[in-house]
């Protein structure tokens, strides 16, 4: 049955302390001109967290629910794309439907393709369940071919 993050513990039976985080991926530190001139590739990623329920707290970045889920997701991506080339993520949005997560990933150009972004994310599903108690499904990845304004960043590797 779906649970909310109020009952979600980052690590079952353990004590967790989180000190976030890292600088956001914003238009002030990354150019928004076309990929060929920036050397940056962007990918749009969407997935469902089927064991959480969406509520209005996920529309408010100041709530504990929003911040904890954003932090866990940001932390996950550090581990998933740890082999290099990962520049960060931005534009995290939460939508209804259990919880639908939408975000944009940035990589150094030429270091990864859509297929590998999706494959590596799917390989992390078990760890997401074990470490963060997040049941992930319905993963979708696509290229972001045009420049966009990278706002409301959730973190770039430090």
């Amino acid at each position: 049955t779906p649970t909310t993050l109020a009952s979600h513990s980052t690590k079952t039976d353990a004590s967790s302390t989180h000190h976030s985080s890292v600088p956001p991926l914003t238009s002030s530190n990354h150019s928004t001109s076309p990929q060929l001139s920036t050397g940056v590739s962007f990918f749009f990623l969407s997935f469902h967290i089927s064991n959480l329920q969406f509520n209005s707290s996920l529309e408010d970045p100041s709530t504990d629910y929003y911040q904890e889920l954003q932090r866990d997701i940001s932390e996950m991506f550090l581990q998933i794309y740890k082999q290099g080339g990962f520049l960060g993520l931005s534009n995290i949005k939460f939508r209804p439907g259990s919880v639908v997560v939408q975000l944009t990933l940035a990589f150094r150009e030429g270091t990864i393709n859509v297929h590998d972004v999706e494959t590596q994310f799917n390989q992390y599903k078990t760890e997401a369940a074990s470490r963060y108690n997040l049941t992930i499904s319905d993963v979708s990845v696509s290229d972001v071919p045009f420049p966009f304004s990278a706002q409301s960043g959730a973190g770039v590797p430090g």
């Epitope: 079952t12 302390t17 989180h18 000190h19 581990q79 740890k82 078990t126 074990s130 590797p157 430090g158």
Partner: antibody, heavy 118, light 111 residues
Amino acid sequence: EVQLVQSGAEVKKPGESLKISCKGSGFTFNYFWIEWVRQMPGKGLEWMGEILPGTGSTNYNEKFKGQVTISADKSISTAYLQWSSLKASDTAMYYCARYDYTSSMDYWGQGTLVTVSS
Amino acid sequence: EIVLTQSPATLSLSPGERATLSCRASESVQYSGTSLMHWYQQKPGQAPRLLIYGASNVETGIPARFSGSGSGTDFTLTISSLEPEDFAVYYCQQNWKVPWTFGQGTKVEIK
């Protein structure tokens, strides 16, 4: 080559403080959890806690919560395990290990022997 | 916490013999087809070394005589033909639920 190099053996008196270290190289230190594992003389392995250096997130085994502090300095790729007041029962070998979600604790430090005796 | 029970505590065998070590978890450590159980070898005065991850995957550099099997709560480490350097203590470990836990170890000694 992935390596975890731990600081040298320590001999301390009860009540003293101590901080031991684990320096990583050959991998992106910030993005891997670093685990600390205790092995008391003649005994098995016990997981103490962990840190993700890139964010500073820590998790502790309840058994060790409040007894030790885990920290890291990502600028020098080093994780730490510290005690504010040692007890004789803290005498043990302490290992750090790298955690990879595909294979758990895949690389280990050589261990730091801590002896606490009056 | 998940308790891992290894058996036997000690296994006395001769070089060339087959060793079968067991690890039983107090609850399932399986998720979506993946077994979150791993095996380590520790020799006296040395750090543990990962042998098997995900119940059956042999870590790079580990000889083919080591194999792992099992799912759910019951897991086995098999050494098909013991070499002199295989006499050591073996630990299973789960990373399905924190705290990560280890079994108490099985000592494989020379008969």
